[in-house]
Amino acid sequence: EPHSLRYNLTVLSWDGSVQSGFLAEVHLDGQPFLRYDRQKCRAKPQGQWAEDVLGNKTWDRETRDLTGNGKDLRMTLAHIKDQKEGLHSLQEIRVCEIHEDNSTRSSQHFYYDGELFLSQNVETEEWTVPQSSRAQTLAMNVRNFLKEDAMKTKTHYHAMHADCLQELRRYLESSVVLRRRVPPMVNVTRSEASEGNITVTCRASSFYPRNITLTWRQDGVSLSHDTQQWGDVLPDGNGTYQTWVATRICQGEEQRFTCYMEHSGNHSTHPVPSGKVLVLQSHW
């Protein structure tokens, strides 16, 4: 998977008046990394691993960047004409990626009241707008404003892209990100399904990086995809990930089934418990 940095900023308006302040979150490699603390007006690391990325360096640079981005987005929201009374939001999501072959990707997306209305591929300078008339109107509105604003020229977008990649590379210099390997905790549980059947679930949690293989095997052979149910691989809030896989088996055949896990070049197999929950830490 590519390394990525994702900025998510939101500004609000009430009865046509743009509110001061903004909401901001930054994800590094899909993990919550920074958020903007509105009380302290500072960028704050999300959890211990985020603090470890920069070590003892301050977060002034991140604070400055987020503050500038928030200000820009408030100005953009002020230029959206059709704001009706009540609460409205403008959200900007900016992502830059560095792939294994060192190629880069960068994109930007705008949402009004949660609905996507404008996207840009920064490399190709291509803008795309969804078909809905509301999106078309909003996009025209915002693009006209962006064209008027000398700051929003092509060079500005390329500079933003370059800044994003520079920050990403700076974070990746930290061995905490590049060499970070947290083995999963794997636990297998069983629950009654229907008469004569049980559902066995294999959960992997607290692992990093995100890539993992988790599958049920019968007599050592992987079950077909259509006989298994997978959960998404999701952040668990601690800078690590979690996922699960489940299948239905005949009661009395538990001994035939094992959960196979592969992560960061290591693997383990986990049997179905005979009745009670079984929790196993993978020891490599």
Epitope: D219, S222, H267
Partner: antibody
């Protein structure tokens, strides 16, 4: 490429025991089960049991429980089958096999002939 | 135990022939059936898994089919190296069981 190298032929006396080995190479040994199969002279194949080399978990054919014991040595990527209280009925070729994770008995050893004779 | 029956214990065919070997299970086995080839020197090789999936490296003249309790292996164009004994094997239920084998000989 995946290879399973079995130990040589054994001539043993009734009542004695024997240990057949199966050395795996060409893949990560603890990833895949090792299966054992018996073939008596001129007869069909019979599944004895299997072992998960990662944790040593075993599943046996009820018929061979008490007769065969499956073990592994992870450090040498070798699986073993210990046969005890041998009788002429145990004279056979014994095969080990492994899987690619998608099909059973994907790769086979060359077989080990065990002859039980006074 | 699920009994696997290969009614034909030996079969004579000529090179280039289309040969079909059958196997029936004592009960439905949900396509959980493999076919193996054992050469006269004792070498065993997996040909077909899960009824009809061709194992990597196996010539396409081998094919498998069937459902429920009845299954078959077909060799579309018999070659000299196909002279061997063929076994079916079920993995629907433990213990895993094999058929008695069908020995293929040249006419």
């Amino acid at each position: 490429q995946v290879q399973l190298q079995q130990s040589g032929p054994e001539l043993v006396k009734p009542g004695a025991s024997v240990k057949v080995s199966c050395k795996a190479s060409g893949y990560a040994f603890t990833k895949y089960n090792i299966y054992w199969v018996k073939q008596s002279h001129g007869k069909s194949l019979e599944w004895i049991g299997y072992i998960d080399p990662y944790n040593g978990g075993t599943v046996y054919n009820q018929k061979f429980k008490g007769k065969a014991t499956l073990t592994v040595d992870k450090s040498s990527s070798t699986a073993y089958m210990h046969l005890n209280s041998l009788t002429s009925e145990d004279s056979a070729v014994y095969y080990c096999a492994t899987t690619d994770g998608y099909s059973l008995f994907t790769y086979w050893g060359q077989g080990t002939l065990v002859t039980v004779s006074a | 135990d699920i009994q696997m029956t290969q009614t034909t214990s030996s079969l004579s065919a000529s090179l280039g022939d289309r040969v079909t070997i059958t196997c029936s299970a004592g009960q439905g086995i949900n396509n959980y059936l493999n076919w193996y080839q054992q050469k006269p020197d004792g070498t065993v090789k997996l040909l077909i898994f899960y009824t009809s999936s061709l194992q990597s490296g196996v010539p396409s003249r081998f094919s498998g089919s069937g459902s429920g309790a009845d299954y078959s292996l077909t060799i579309s164009n018999l070659e000299p190296e196909d002279i061997a004994t063929y076994y079916c094997q079920q993995y629907s239920k433990l213990p895993l069981t094999f058929g008695a084998g069908t020995k293929l000989e040249l006419k």
